[in-house]
């Protein structure tokens, strides 16, 4: 239930965070799930635990598997699972889909590409950036902190961008690479006050206890590339990331551009294993841009299990 997928390349550093949060958390113990053998905390080991983090320095293909973390406190212990896959390095330039992090979009005014997972590592600037395996050179490219800025973005800048950095652990250096796709949005157009297409205001969404449910927040912001436009979900007025419920996650849907030229965004709220208490929460679909913010509120109600017209995964 509290499981997270992580991946890396052999001979590179990989650091994984325990997907379970104790409230509160005093110590975290890590185990090999298959053998129940404790993972050492001594840093001289190639694979070792360091609080909420599990470190592979460096990773090997044989490290692939499921790891158990137990968050301990004086009162109760909570368990999570990290599903780790370590892949062999590709001989060619092609980065397979299973090694790709989420796609990001940019425009002439906003062209930041963040280096995925870098916050878990002890790294020092500058990052090295590559596009389709070629080192980026020229004044248009600026590596700034944990992201790449591209000046005067053009359609040709779309592609796969790899960040490469060095993780330092007790004086030893380990290489890390991470790749994500970058797409370029057309700059022509205008922006409007956000229009939320879904959900309807004060919509009641029927869900079935124990099943999965998806809520889609969809809004349009104008025509062409939008300088600042976002859709997001809030629970009881709190950001999903701050809410701290691993069962409830939001995922960016497809950036849409309809035939009428409207620029729209989707954000899908995924609720795994719907619980009774989820019915008590207020779900707010927020759409915001430079013109302002629009909010549509949704509440969940229990669905009659006999009714098979459903939105479940």
């Amino acid at each position: 239930k509290f499981s997270k997928q992580s991946w890396g390349l052999e001979n590179e550093a990989l650091i994984v965070r325990c997907p379970r949060q104790g409230k509160p958390s005093y110590t975290v113990d890590w185990y090999y799930s298959q053998t129940n053998k404790s993972i050492p905390t001594q840093e001289r080991n190639r694979v070792f635990a360091s609080g909420q983090l599990l470190k592979f320095l460096p990773a090997a293909v044989a490290d692939s598997g499921i790891y158990t973390c137990i968050v301990r406190s004086p009162t109760f212990n909570r368990t999570g699972y990290a599903n780790v896959t370590i892949y062999k390095k590709q001989s060619d330039c092609n980065v397979p889909d299973y090694l790709m992090y989420s796609t990001v979009s940019g425009s002439e005014k906003n062209s930041k590409i963040y280096c995925p997972t870098i916050d878990l590592y002890n790294w020092t600037a500058p990052l090295e950036w590559f596009k389709n395996c070629q080192a980026l050179q020229g004044s248009r490219y600026r590596a700034h902190k944990s992201f790449l800025v591209i000046d005067n973005v053009m359609t040709e800048d779309a592609g796969d961008y790899t960040c490469k950095f060095i993780h330092n652990e007790n004086g030893a250096n380990y290489s890390v690479t991470a790749t994500r796709s970058f797409t370029v949005k057309d700059e022509q157009g205008f922006s409007l006050f956000p229009v939320i297409g879904a959900p309807a205001q004060n919509e009641i969404k029927e869900v079935e206890i124990g099943k999965n449910a998806n809520l889609t927040c969809s809004a349009c912001f104008g025509k062409g590339t939008q300088f600042l436009a976002a859709v997001l979900w809030q629970l009881n007025g709190t950001k999903i990331t701050d809410f701290g419920e691993p069962r409830i996650q939001q995922e960016e849907g497809q950036n849409q551009s309809f035939s009428n030229g409207l620029a729209c965004l989707d954000m899908v709220l995924r609720i795994a294993d719907v619980k009774e208490e989820d019915l008590l929460l207020q779900y707010d679909c927020l759409a915001l841009n430079l013109h302002g913010l629009r909010r549509h509120t949704v509440r969940l109600s229990r669905k009659n299990p006999i009714d098979h017209h459903s939105i479940y995964c």
Epitope: Q21, G22, K23, P24, S25, Y26, T27, G51, P74, T75, F76, L235, N236, G237, T238, F243, G244, E245, I248, K275, E277, L281
Partner: antibody
Framework: EVQLVQSGAEVKKPGATVKISCKAS????????MHWVQQAPGKGLEWMGA????????VYAEKFQGRVTITADKSSSTAYMELSSLRSEDTAVYYC???????????WGQGTLVTVSS | DIQMTQSPSSLSASVGDRVTITCRSS???????????LYWYQQKPGKAPKLLIY???NLASGVPSRFSSSGSGTDFTLTISSLQPEDFATYYC?????????FGQGTKVEIK
Amino acid sequence: EVQLVQSGAEVKKPGATVKISCKASGYIFIDSEMHWVQQAPGKGLEWMGAIDPETGDTVYAEKFQGRVTITADKSSSTAYMELSSLRSEDTAVYYCTGSTTDYYFAYWGQGTLVTVSS
Amino acid sequence: DIQMTQSPSSLSASVGDRVTITCRSSKSLLHSNGIIYLYWYQQKPGKAPKLLIYQLSNLASGVPSRFSSSGSGTDFTLTISSLQPEDFATYYCAQNLELPFTFGQGTKVEIK
């Protein structure tokens, strides 16, 4: 905004049982432990016990063991504290208090006064 | 059980005064993770306690910077650098190192 709302004051006779409720809102109920703390009139704070609403696991202070039962109803995001075999020294304000990632006793209910009198 | 002993049990002070409350635990509150699990709470008459400081020296959200806490494994101090009218209350130290969680008996800060 996190809120813990407790049930109203109670007057009980010695030997009776009291059950206090604590309704949580503004956060995921099952994600945070719920603790109960006693405060006798003019006295200090005393930890009674706690529940993990997700699993129903409980832990109690030795002083209250056998007389206190803490439960949680996930469907209504409500925790309960039941104290049996009441005696006059159980006259106190009882608080429910929730935890966060960093610390216990982060959020508090308004308190419920229980008076035990014959 | 870990005993928490506060002193003084009460004190009188004026607005603007620097106030110090001490707390001693019968056992070190230093966990193997390096954190000292000492907490301070403020309680006003008829109200629930309010968290002031967690893990020895961290100010809880919304707590003014005039409150500070320091100490070692067993001896701790809560300091109010310049007492304000709203600070007149009872202060409790507490330990969350191990069960049962225990509180000090409280220090009442009164207007002189």
